[in-house]
Interface confidence: low
């Protein structure tokens, strides 16, 4: 409408007793420059006088009359486009409507702005994303509909009352569109943060508490599991029994299915929280874990390494390489399945024990003819001594020696 003055400013401004209010404002008059400006508090039009009645907070006229409020209220505008105002300090009874009475040479206008002043600092508002999942970075936002150049504030994040280590980014807006202070915190919640309290605390420049907002974190996560085994060290002998129990320490949402895995493969018909293994055999050795699923996904317990112990089985000897040429190197390896691994080996050369040879491997860097023959071994662990296997033959090839003429 070409018959109207054009104003831009926030519709409502918020503050509290003792703070200040900064009112960003622009305008465009219908004609010419501004000649008179009056700031009213709760103005009312008087039909009899054809003028506005109300408390005059600020007055700028040709004759230069200045109300007592003039020190507290400042008009920071100009004669043609800026109508920014500042009230410092602002009081509870400033709440209501502010009326900007503008007069040019031929035109008049009353622009109204709402001012909401509370008795105490009002709380900020924490905004969370609709869903929070463990280990997925989210941005927590704390918004306060307040900012004023004369009254510095800060927003601090707390988790369970302790300042959060992550760096927050604080931004302020003092524009004709919006006035606010905002703090954004990037945060990768862990499952253990579920149910914890996050606080955004409004503080003054000295760090003094003014107000706060709190939220309880709802962190969606896969089931968190604990596996318990009897016996606790998961070391048994063949024929013993083993019991494994799966406990859910946390799940959000609730769990739906349970299963057991051995060496990464699902065990059939094992869908309860207890796994009973009776009269175990050595092939049941392996890594066991339980898996419990919810709508987020499957959770796995730590692995339990079940060791089914048994005495060494009959040994075999592997020779690398036979036949061997004199001066070449040879390695003997004593092979025997056992749990725990053999701690001691006894080596035999042509049926005679090789003194001091107690390791799994015997390495001969330089073979001589006297090394030829049958090599066998016996493996020993804490459960017993294995049997000596058939052994392996080392053939040593060498050139003629001590040639005599007959």
């Amino acid at each position: 409408d070409s018959s109207k003055w054009v104003f831009e400013h926030p519709e409502t401004l918020y503050a509290w007793e003792g703070a200040c209010v900064w009112i960003p404002c622009t305008y465009r008059a219908l004609d010419g420059d501004l000649e008179s400006f009056i700031l009213f508090h709760n103005p009312e039009y008087n039909k009899n006088t054809s003028k506005f009645d109300g408390t005059r907070l600020y007055e700028s006229t040709k004759d230069g009359k200045v109300p007592s409020e003039q020190k507290r209220v400042q008009f920071l505008g100009d004669k043609n486009k800026n109508c920014t105002l500042s009230i410092h300090p602002v009081h509870l009874n400033d709440s209501g409507q502010l009326g900007l009475r503008m007069e040019s040479k031929t035109e008049k206008w009353m622009e109204r702005i709402h001012l909401n002043v509370s008795e105490r600092p009002f709380p900020p508002h924490i905004q969370l994303p609709p869903e929070i999942q463990e280990s997925q970075e989210v941005t927590l936002t704390c918004l306060l509909n307040f900012s004023c150049y004369g009254y510095p504030i800060q927003l601090q994040w707390l988790l369970e009352g302790v300042p959060m280590r992550q760096a927050a980014v604080t931004s302020t807006s003092l524009t004709i569109k919006s006035v606010f202070t905002r703090s954004e915190l990037k945060f990768s919640p862990q499952w253990s943060h579920h149910g914890k309290i996050v606080t955004c605390q409004l503080q003054d420049a000295d760090g003094k508490f003014l107000s706060n907002d709190t939220v309880q974190l709802n962190v969606k996560h896969t089931p968190k599991l604990e596996i318990k085994v009897t016996p606790s060290d998961a070391i048994v002998r063949e024929g013993d029994s083993v019991t494994m129990t799966c406990e859910v320490s946390s799940s959000n949402p609730e769990y739906t299915t349970v299963s057991w895995l051995k060496d990464g493969t699902s065990l059939k018909k094992q869908n309860t929280f207890t796994l009973n293994l009776r009269e175990v055999t050595k092939d049941q050795s392996g890594k066991y874990c339980c898996q419990v699923s919810n709508d987020v996904g499957p959770g796995r317990s730590e692995e339990v390494f079940l060791q089914v112990q048994y005495a060494p089985e009959p040994s075999t000897v592997q020779i690398l390489h036979s036949p061997a040429v004199e001066g070449s190197q040879v390695e003997f390896l004593c092979m025997s399945l056992a749990n725990p691994l053999p701690t001691n080996y006894t080596w035999y050369h042509n049926g005679k024990e090789m003194q001091g040879r107690t390791e799994e491997k015997v390495h001969i860097p330089k073979i001589l003819p006297w090394h030829a023959g049958t090599y066998s071994c016996v493996a020993e662990n804490i459960l017993g001594t294995g049997q000596r296997g058939p052994g392996a033959e080392l053939d040593v090839q060498y050139p003629p020696k001590k040639v005599t003429t007959v």
């Epitope: 003194q355 001091g356 390791e359 491997k361 015997v362 390495h363 001969i364 860097p365 330089k366």
Partner: nanobody, 122 residues
Framework: QVQLVESGGGLVQAGGSLRLSCAAS????????IGWFRQAPGKEREGVSC????????YYADSVKGRFTISRDNAKNTVYLQMNSLRPEDTAVYHC???????????????WGQGTQVTVSS
């Protein structure tokens, strides 16, 4: 009776050198193995180097190849181990040993000396 007496150990900075000596006596055979093994506290003994008396052929553990050299002086019945570019992980008691065979794990456990301490500081 075979007797082996080691000397030459000591404290040296990383990158430095030492020369160990082993004086052997009482060995009657011409065909035997003599060499060095080492043992660090709490660790398995580890063969370092071995030499056959018959042809002077030498063998080294992978960890010392190119840095250590075994040699002998027949006239003095002495075997030497020249250790260059020493590293902190070379710190151990070094024993001289003699026996019928050279093994990766050392010379065999027939005869060995009291040892000499080598400490390499970083």
């Amino acid at each position: 009776q075979v007797q082996l007496v080691e000397s030459g150990g000591g404290l040296v900075q990383a990158g430095g050198s030492l020369r160990l000596s082993c004086a052997a006596s009482g060995i009657t055979s011409d065909d035997y193995a003599i060499g060095w093994f080492r043992q660090a506290p709490g660790k398995e003994r580890e063969g370092v180097s071995c030499m056959y008396s018959s042809d002077g052929s030498t063998y080294y553990a992978d960890s010392v190849k190119g840095r250590f050299t075994i040699s002998r002086d027949n006239a003095k019945n002495t075997v030497y181990l020249q250790m260059n570019s020493l590293r902190p992980e070379d710190t151990a008691v070094y024993h001289c040993a003699a026996g019928p065979w050279c093994f990766v794990t050392g010379v065999g456990r027939e005869e060995w000396g009291q040892g000499t301490q080598v400490t390499v500081s970083s």
